[in-house]
């Protein structure tokens, strides 16, 4: 069980498993056919730089060079898209930095990148007004790189409308996905804008495109898809976040935890609070409110936004992270100034890793 | 084909403890879960607790929290069920069941569903 | 925790009958739901997982439907093997919880 009381207050469990996961996002770079794509690898420390796309080790070519830590694509084709990855090799372990690259006519692409949720428009699916397809949560589309340990079942979901109402099919690597294309083959739900793989396995891994389509338009929207088959490590933390804060009585403020993961990994922020003017149960344990954690009614876990704060909410916050590994925290403090006083950097405190554990 | 064989139930008195074993063959025992599910004599079906195969993280229901254990030997392709502090509401059939996760990549959780089920067990706890 | 509501309790029907149980979550588990039969002394089997997916192996009368609290179970013919005690179960939040089961006895 974690080393800490819990005030009464707080209803999350947290030596329970998350039923949400959550991995960061890695960046996309999007080039026009024809262009040239530089990317450099967002690592410290590397002393030697391995790279790869969708999981296949990347060599020099023709039109791909690779010198140090940056990495150039010549003449992008279509082809160019995927998931990459750069990985730094230490003495003592090794580090990853995904990116994905999307080459394609932004024009004609049909992407969701610039797309509304169309909840704003107010129009009747029965009426007359004829309508091109459109995702209804774009927000629940972001995430796009999903890692799932082998032998699990992975559910792929495209929620759109239109007038009238659109089709959906699935593409895996740009192209048709067939039944026979896997044992087993897949199932698809329509009404739910679904697409399920039960017991999934390496072979398994790539993009996975659905395509949403009327008379009207046309939508598509990727996926990738990673099959975890490796020992998942212990979440890692983004060094430098959450990143010390300070602000005026009734200012508001943000800390970001940024979170990467091969297993579900469980966001928790907690905050040291007093208890009948104690910080400290009576098992010497020190009491820790929980304040925000993922969950399946729970925005974005990896941030956690305080607003129009009071000299009470000054002090440490701690982004604990938790899989069925094990876990890491890193913190930051809040310092809450006089209305009178400008807000200025802190000095960085880090907690040990093992502060939690 | 996969086959879960559950074994060590019996009669325990009130305050005793129990050790019950599923032994799994048939799938990589690694990559899913272990849940055990209970039914006491004529009523309903009640979820006890889970563990991820992969290094034997668990979970409970709140009715067994601190008196009952799950852990499993990989090498032996066994999950077991330590069940201490017995009292007479712990008598049932006990079922070790497969779990495995479905990731919903739009909503963002994950569903765990029990497909392959032992043959059961019965405890009961009476003096 | 969250509670599951079976309805009905029990109900009679002949073989060719058209069956539905509905089961009713006390907040939403969006599609998380799974349906299980349970022959008496046996362990339960696997029908339906997320709603409305059909487990592999499971006849195609056997059919679920809903999201969010309201969910349903269809059998489009009953057959002899499938009087049984018919059980839903959500998995979204923790713990997991089974509704108190329908019976479908022979009329």
């Known amino acids: 069980r974690p080393s800490f009381s819990l005030v009464e207050d707080t209803t999350l469990e947290p030596e329970e498993p998350p039923t949400k996961y959550q991995i960061s996002q890695p960046e996309v770079y999007v080039a026009a056919p024809g262009e040239s794509l530089e990317v450099r690898c967002l690592l410290k420390d590397a002393a030697v730089i391995s790279w790869t796309k969708d999981g296949v080790h990347l060599g020099p070519n023709n039109r791909t060079v690779l010198i140090g830590e940056y990495l150039q694509i010549k003449g992008a084709t279509p082809r160019d898209s995927g998931l990459y990855a750069c990985t730094a090799s230490r003495t003592v372990d090794s580090e990853t930095w995904y990116f994905m690259v999307n080459v394609t006519d932004a024009i004609s692409s049909g992407d969701d990148e610039d797309d509304t949720d169309g909840a704003e428009d107010f129009v009747s699916e029965n009426s007359n007004n004829k309508r091109a397809p459109y995702w209804t949560n774009t927000e629940k589309m972001e995430k796009r790189l999903h890692a799932v340990p082998a032998a699990n079942t992975v559910k792929f979901r495209c929620p759109a409308g239109g007038n009238p109402m659109p089709t959906m099919r699935w593409l895996k690597n740009g192209k048709e996905f067939k039944q026979e294309h896997r044992i087993g083959g897949y199932k698809v739900r329509n009404q739910h804008w679904s697409l399920i793989m039960e017991s999934v396995v390496p072979s398994d891994k790539g993009n996975y495109t659905c395509v949403v389509e009327n008379e009207y338009g046309s939508i598509n929207h990727t996926y990738h898809l990673d099959v975890v088959e490796r020992s998942p490590h212990r979440p890692i933390l983004q060094a430098g976040l959450p990143a010390n804060a300070s602000t005026v009585v009734g200012g508001d403020v943000e800390f970001v935890c940024k979170v990467y993961s091969d297993a579900q990994p469980h966001i928790q922020w907690i905050k040291h609070v007093e208890k009948n003017g104690s910080k400290y149960g009576p098992d010497g344990l020190p009491y820790l409110k929980v304040l925000k954690h993922s969950g399946i009614n729970s925005s974005n876990a990896e941030v956690l936004a305080l607003f129009n704060v009071t000299e009470a909410d000054a002090g440490e916050y701690i982004c604990k992270v938790s899989n069925y590994i094990g876990q890491a925290n890193q913190s930051a403090w809040l310092t809450v100034l006089p209305k009178q006083q400008a807000p200025g950097r802190e000095k960085e405190i880090t907690a040990s890793p093992d502060y939690l554990e | 084909e996969v086959q879960l064989v559950e074994s060590g139930g019996g009669l325990v008195q009130p305050g005793g403890s129990l050790r019950l074993s599923c032994a799994a063959s048939?799938?990589?025992?690694?990559?899913?879960?272990i849940s055990w599910v209970r039914q006491a004599p004529g009523k309903g079906l009640e979820w006890v607790g889970r563990?991820?195969?992969?290094?034997?993280?668990?979970n409970y229901a709140d009715s067994v929290k601190g008196r009952f254990t799950i852990s499993a030997d990989t090498s032996k392709n066994t999950a077991y069920l330590q069940m201490n502090s017995l009292r007479a509401e712990d008598t049932a059939v006990y079922y070790c069941a497969r779990t495995y996760g479905i990731y919903d990549t739009y909503d963002m959780y994950t569903e765990y569903v029990m497909d392959y089920w032992g043959q059961g067990t019965l405890v009961t706890v009476s003096s | 925790d969250i509670q599951m509501t079976q309805s009905p309790s029990s109900l009679s029907a002949s073989v060719g009958d058209r069956v539905t149980i509905t089961c009713r979550a006390s907040?939403?588990?969006?599609?998380?739901l799974a349906w299980y039969k349970q022959k008496p002394g046996k362990a339960p089997k696997l029908l339906i997982y997320?709603?409305?997916f059909l487990y592999s192996g499971v006849p195609s009368r056997f059919s679920g439907s809903g999201s969010g609290t309201d969910f349903t179970l269809t059998i489009s013919s009953l057959q002899p093997e499938d009087f049984a005690t018919y059980y839903c179960q959500q998995s979204t939040g923790h713990p997991q919880t089974f509704g108190q089961g329908t019976k479908v006895e022979i009329k």
């Open positions: 048939g799938f990589p025992f690694t990559s899913t879960g």
């Open positions: 907040q939403d588990v969006d599609t998380s």
């Open positions: 997320s709603a409305s």
């Open positions: 563990t991820h195969l992969g290094d034997g993280s668990t």
